[in-house]
């Protein structure tokens, strides 16, 4: 059985390492992965009362 990588991360962990293009930062295991491996929140319907949230997972330029 493998431990999730997050289990080893201290509370004072550094900010996310910039990911290469076409990779995104996986907030749940705290490392860069292919963007296609991740699910993001469902988009808000047009005219929704609250603005769409910014995501911390966008590919690094």
């Amino acid at each position: 059985m493998r431990r999730g990588p997050r289990s080893l991360r201290g509370r004072d962990a550094p900010a996310p390492t910039p990911c290469v293009p076409a990779e995104c930062f996986d907030l749940l295991v705290r490392h860069c992965v292919a963007c296609g491996a991740l699910r993001t929140p469902r988009p808000k319907p047009a005219g929704a009362s609250s603005p769409a949230p910014r995501t911390a997972l966008q590919p690094q330029e």
């Epitope: 999730g4 491996a37 929140p41």
Partner: antibody
Framework: EVQLQESGPSLVKPSQTLSLTCSVT????????WNWIRKFPGNKLEFMGY???????YYNPSLKSRISITRDTSKNQYYLQLNSVTTEDTATYYC???????????WGQGTTLTVSA | DIVLTQSPVSLAVSLGQRATISCRAS??????????MHWYQQKPGQPPKLLIY???DLESGIPARFSGSGSGTDFTLTINPVETDDVAIYYC?????????FGGGTKLEIK
């Protein structure tokens, strides 16, 4: 839209092994995280563990010696195996998948398990 | 494990009034400037339904009567105004640290 459906026995005897299946439609289990959660009769919710896009598993330490989560990507299904069950494992078992922040936006309807001799 | 303590355990509110549910974490659930705190509603015979994620973001399709606030260790779910359909158990959940944990739940009833 992602849909999840649990299947498995409703009654298991103490000391036996519980095996549940979560069938996923609307998305591939090679994307995201695929969780098992259970709700006990007293309304307590417990996160059991997950298998993610790469096949990496994480298990709640409270279950670690008894639990296994596996998957079959060709069937788009993932599985829960819980060994040596006791009456304390009587609960409703849910499969669910979270988005970016770990918030679970899609859930199965749940399957109720009773552990009894 | 991060322990989430919800209060009150049960709550009776008049129709049209405000309901406020608190969730206190045993340690901060913030990381990278994000609060990894989420809120769910569960009705009998149904799975939990995601209402709020990242402490204050309203899930798609959830009415704006529901709102969330807080950071660090103290979080609040507010329902204003309360409607009959809101009778349910409400749970907070953190995904900041393994293992992910849930609060004990708050049962909302109509007065």
């Amino acid at each position: 839209e992602v849909q999840l459906q649990e299947s498995g026995p409703s009654l298991v005897k103490p000391s036996q092994t519980l095996s549940l299946t979560c069938s996923v439609t609307g998305d591939s289990i090679t994307r995201g995280y695929w969780n098992w959660i259970r709700k006990f009769p007293g309304n307590k919710l417990e996160f059991m563990g997950y298998i993610n896009y790469s096949g990496t598993t994480y298990y709640n330490p409270s279950l670690k010696s008894r639990i296994s989560i596996t998957r079959d990507t060709s069937k788009n299904q993932y599985y829960l195996q819980l060994n040596s069950v006791t009456t304390e494992d009587t609960a409703t078992y849910y499969c669910a998948t979270p988005h970016t922040y770990g918030a679970m936006d899609y859930w199965g309807q749940g399957t109720t398990l009773t552990v009894s001799a | 494990d991060i322990v989430l303590t919800q209060s009150p355990v049960s709550l009776a509110v008049s129709l049209g009034q405000r309901a406020t549910i608190s969730c206190r974490a045993s340690e901060s659930v913030d990381d990278y400037g994000i609060s990894f705190m989420h809120w769910y509603q569960q009705k009998p015979g149904q799975p939990p339904k995601l209402l709020i994620y990242r402490a204050s973001d309203l899930e798609s399709g959830i009415p704006a009567r529901f709102s969330g606030s807080g950071s660090g260790t103290d979080f609040t779910l507010t329902i204003n105004p309360v409607e009959t359909d809101d009778v349910a158990i409400y749970y907070c959940q953190q995904t900041s640290k393994d293992p992910w944990t849930f609060g004990g739940g708050t049962k909302l009833e109509i007065k």
